[in-house]
């Protein structure tokens, strides 16, 4: 059991001791303690290096020391005449006589006490990696800030691991580096790039100091690459010992620096990049590589572009080259395509047309293209003859690539309106007569088709409703039919500038500028229902002559009917505008001066009570063309009149041929480019 | 939005006149037309007749040829109906109706005027 | 002028069943392959309601258990099923030459 004192004395002290004689005592005091071990008393023989008799003392391993001869105090007021500190709670004391004593040796007497050790100061091995603290009995450790103590409550480390980098360039450095790098840690970094690119670290000799390796070889602090089943290292010493360029072949790396608890250098700093995978430089017959490079990586992107009458067939799409690939297994994207014969496929089919399927579609190849007659024609001329050109393209002579545009034919009615009967005072109609015609329902009115994507109507009839229902192709705007025929939706509105919007519209004197166009949002397809009317031309061949006789449609007011549901016709002569002005307005709403005549009016009407009423808003006044008797053109627009059954007023369309033309322009889509 | 607001009841003398009005509102009377019907007490609708406010063409019914007077004013979107040397016959509800985008129907109605004829 | 019979003043059915309306003309009212037959709903002081137009044609808005049928003198209007809130005058009108005319206005009760 330890004790914390106790008393040793030789055998028969203070007798002299015996011949022959080996005694051992084992002295222990509690863990924690050391030993104060001192003689008040030493008389044995004495001999060279204490040969013959002896009192030795043992700590461990190491003699602390070994006593004969005799010894007195130096120190009046101490009877010690010898003792020893150990910082250890044991401790052996052997005392050894030979066979013959001279002369008679009384032998010793010692004592020994429990003493606190400094376990911070007291050992070569200092017991704490960084802050000891002592107290009676034991000691504890401690760390500086932003370290922690490892579980054997001895060291101290850092927390210098969990980092993953994912740049494709970065740099990595030991903790606190250049300072010294923590002692007793374990660091580990991860780089984890993309596929297709490799981990390659650069180092500098100069930017590496690890503690160096012991005397086997072995090192002490060590900084290793672990790339899948590659390791590069472990690495330590002044000066970066491996090879400055570490290519990995791997997209993912695992460095871990490892310290022990002695030998704090100023650590290491390294580079990475991401290299990229290679790929071959592959032989593609009939073909050019752009750019030609001799050497290609992940990522590289090259145009293969096939000599001209060869190209790439990939599903049912020619093309005259492709872009390849280096992916990041090192292989190239697309390797199936190669670069064959030219078959220019199966030609584009073009809007409102045909063409005919091809006995052939390689090299050399003729096509014809054909509008949809006798709605459509061919506008951009060319014939519609295409042969399959050296680059993959059906190509005609006139037009190149550039597909036939068929657009609608204007001005021709399907079958010409024939008077049956004496609008007002007209005859029942078929919307074959005017394919043109276009029913408004809100407010109840007409306009003129004169493209697949505009329509043109009088100003006032849209000025309250900018998003109005309109229907094409059925001579009954009975609801049943309607819902058969095609219903138009708008996208814009555009209204003349001249057009004045008033606040209160009942009240209006003036019609001048009484035009709009409508734009929609689909294109109309033509028939022999539905298709436009000519606009004029801006020759005085076009000027209106009194006599000159148009066709008015609608569904308007009739003698019978506030609203038509079968479609009504009439022709008119053009009359001169004083007939108009002379007619008393039925209703005015201010004098009869007030209302305004302007050139941009055409006054018809006048014969046998025929005229537009009410409802007929914005139909065409349509006119044989004077240089085409087969196509009518649109000359006025129903606008206003003063007395239903009299004269009408009709807006003179040629006076705003180069309006329309320029909104349309200015509000077309591509596809009517 | 569609609506038809018609002027309040009316309780006149016999032998008197009374104007009833309609006045529009989301659209314009002058694009349209105003008809008018009669409702008496717990009897069935009757047709008085029509105008077009664009132009005041009316159609009347030959039973009001004499009774009603239908006028519109476009200025005010307003449509009023004159009713003349009224009776207790003349008792009733008097509606304005239109006919919309339809051609010979009429999916807007006022609310309609009471007319009570009374000594 | 076109004299309208409906040939009956009251009509009672029950919830769920069919409700037929009949009206019959003095003379045709169909114009160039039309027929200028409407019918309405009115309840107790309100306004009349329009159900079909053109004989045929349902009102937008009109539940579709609404139908109407018929040409030249003689009209149908059905109710298949019919409901509580269908309770109601129903009158056919015919606008196809003046005077325009109403008919009697038979009363619909549910059972």
């Known amino acids: 059991e330890p004790t914390m004192y106790g008393e040793i004395l030789s055998p028969n002290y203070p007798q002299a001791y015996p011949s022959e004689v080996e005694k051992s005592w084992d002295i222990e005091v509690p863990e924690g303690y050391g030993i104060h071990l001192y003689f008040t008393h030493l008389d044995i023989e004495l001999s060279e290096n204490c040969a013959y008799d002896s009192v030795q003392i043992i700590s461990g391993d190491t003699e602390e020391g070994r006593l004969c001869g005799q010894r007195s105090s130096n120190n009046p007021h101490s009877p010690i005449v010898e003792e020893f500190q150990v910082p250890y709670n044991k401790l052996q004391v052997i005392f050894k006589s030979d066979f013959s004593n001279e002369e008679r040796f009384t032998g010793f007497a010692a004592y020994y006490v429990a003493t606190d050790i400094n376990e911070c100061t007291d050992f070569v091995d200092v017991p704490c990696s960084h802050f000891c603290n002592n107290f009676i009995g034991g000691y504890f450790c401690s760390c500086p800030p932003e370290y922690f103590l490892h579980d054997d409550m001895k060291n101290c480390g850092v927390n210098c691991s969990g980092d993953v980098f994912t740049a494709l360039i970065g740099e990595i450095a030991s903790p606190n580096y250049p300072k010294p790098y923590p002692e007793n840690s374990r660091c580990e970094y991860q780089i984890r790039l993309e596929k297709g690119f490799q981990v390659v670290v650069t180092l500098r000799r100069e930017d590496f100091d690890v503690e160096a390796a012991d005397s086997a070889g072995n090192c002490l602090d060590s900084l290793v690459f672990v790339a899948g089943d590659r390791q590069f290292g472990p690495y330590c010493g002044h000066g970066f010992p491996g090879p400055l360029n570490i290519e990995t072949k791997s997209n993912a790396l695992d460095i871990i620096f490892q310290t022990d608890l002695t030998g704090q250098k100023k650590g290491w700093k390294l580079r990475y990049h991401g290299d990229p995978m290679p790929c071959p430089k592959e032989d593609t017959p009939n073909s050019v590589w752009e750019p030609a490079k001799a050497k290609y990586v992940f990522r590289d992107v090259v145009q293969i572009t096939c000599l001209d009458g060869f190209e790439v067939v990939e599903g049912r799409v020619g093309a005259t080259s492709f872009y390849s690939t280096c992916q990041s297994n090192g292989k190239w994207s697309n390797s199936k395509l190669k670069c064959q014969p030219v078959d220019c496929g199966i030609p584009e089919s073009i809007e409102n047309g045909k063409v005919e399927d091809p006995e052939s579609t390689l090299f050399g190849s003729v096509i014809r293209y054909t509008c949809e007659e006798p709605y459509y024609y061919m506008e951009n001329g060319g014939g519609g003859e295409y042969h399959c050109a050296g680059n993959g393209s059906w190509v005609n002579e006139v037009l190149g690539p550039e597909l036939p545009k068929c657009v609608p034919v204007c001005g021709v009615p399907r079958e010409p309106f024939e008077e049956k009967q004496r609008i007002i005072g007209g005859s029942d109609a078929d919307i074959k007569n005017f394919p043109w015609q276009v029913f408004f329902d809100n407010p109840w009115a007409g306009g003129a088709l004169i493209n697949e994507y505009w329509v043109l109507t009088a100003a006032h009839v849209v000025e309250g409703n900018r998003e109005p229902t309109m229907y094409v192709g059925s001579t009954s705007v009975q609801t049943s039919r309607l819902a058969k025929s095609k219903m138009l939706t708008p996208e814009h509105v555009f209204i003349h500038p001249g057009w004045k919007l008033l606040e209160v519209p009942e009240g209006r004197t003036n019609f001048d500028n009484d035009i709009a166009l409508v734009r929609l949002k689909d294109p109309v397809k033509m028939g022999p229902t539905v298709s436009p009317i000519c606009l004029p031309g801006t020759s005085s061949d076009y000027n209106l002559m009194d006599g000159d006789l148009g066709l008015i449609s609608g569904w308007g007011r009739t003698e019978k009917r506030d609203r038509a549901v079968r479609l009504k016709a009439a022709r008119l002569p053009v009359a001169p505008l004083r007939k108009c002005k002379e007619v008393k307005v039925e209703k005015p709403t201010a004098d009869a001066e007030a209302y305004v005549f302007t050139p941009n009016m055409i006054c018809a009407g006048g014969e046998k009570g025929m005229d537009s009423c009410k409802g007929d808003s914005g139909g065409a006044f349509a006119v044989q063309d004077p240089n085409d008797k087969t196509k009518f053109y649109a000359a006025g627009l129903v606008s206003w009149g003063p007395q239903c059954g009299t004269y009408g007023l009709y807006t003179r369309v040629k006076n705003y041929v180069d309006w329309i033309m320029k909104t349309m322009q200015e509000n077309s889509t591509p596809r009517e480019d | 939005e569609v609506k038809l607001e018609q002027s309040g009841a009316e309780l006149v003398r016999p032998g008197a006149s009374v104007k009833l009005s309609c006045t529009a509102s989301g659209f314009n009377i002058k694009d349209d037309y105003i008809h008018w019907v009669k409702q008496r007490p717990e009897q069935g609708l009757e047709w008085i007749g029509r105008i077009d406010p664009a132009d005041d063409h009316t159609k009347y019914a030959p039973k009001f040829q004499d009774k009603a007077t239908m006028t519109a004013d476009t200025s005010s979107n307003t449509a009023c109906l004159q009713l003349n040397s009224l009776t207790s016959e003349d008792t009733a509800v008097y509606y304005c109706?239109?006919?919309?985008?339809?051609?010979?129907?009429?999916?807007?109605w006022g609310q309609g005027t009471l007319v009570s004829v009374s000594a | 002028f076109a004299l309208m019979t409906q040939s009956t003043d009251y009509l009672a059915v029950s919830l769920g069943q069919r409700a037929t309306i009949s009206c019959k003309a003095s003379?045709?009212?169909?114009?160039?392959?039309?027929?200028?037959m409407n019918w309405y709903q009115q309840k107790p002081g309100q306004p009349p309601k329009l159900l079909i137009y053109a004989a045929s044609n349902l009102e937008s808005g009109i539940p579709t258990r609404f139908s109407g049928s018929g040409f030249g003198t003689d009209f149908t209007l059905n109710i298949h099923p019919v409901e509580e809130e269908d309770a109601a005058t129903y009158y056919c009108?015919?606008?196809?030459?003046?005077?325009?005319?109403f008919g009697g206005g038979p009363k619909l009760e549910i059972k």
């Open positions: 109706a239109i006919y919309g985008s339809g051609w010979a129907w009429f999916p807007y």
């Open positions: 009108q015919q606008s196809n030459e003046d005077p325009w005319t």
């Open positions: 003379q045709s009212v169909d114009y160039d392959g039309d027929s200028y």
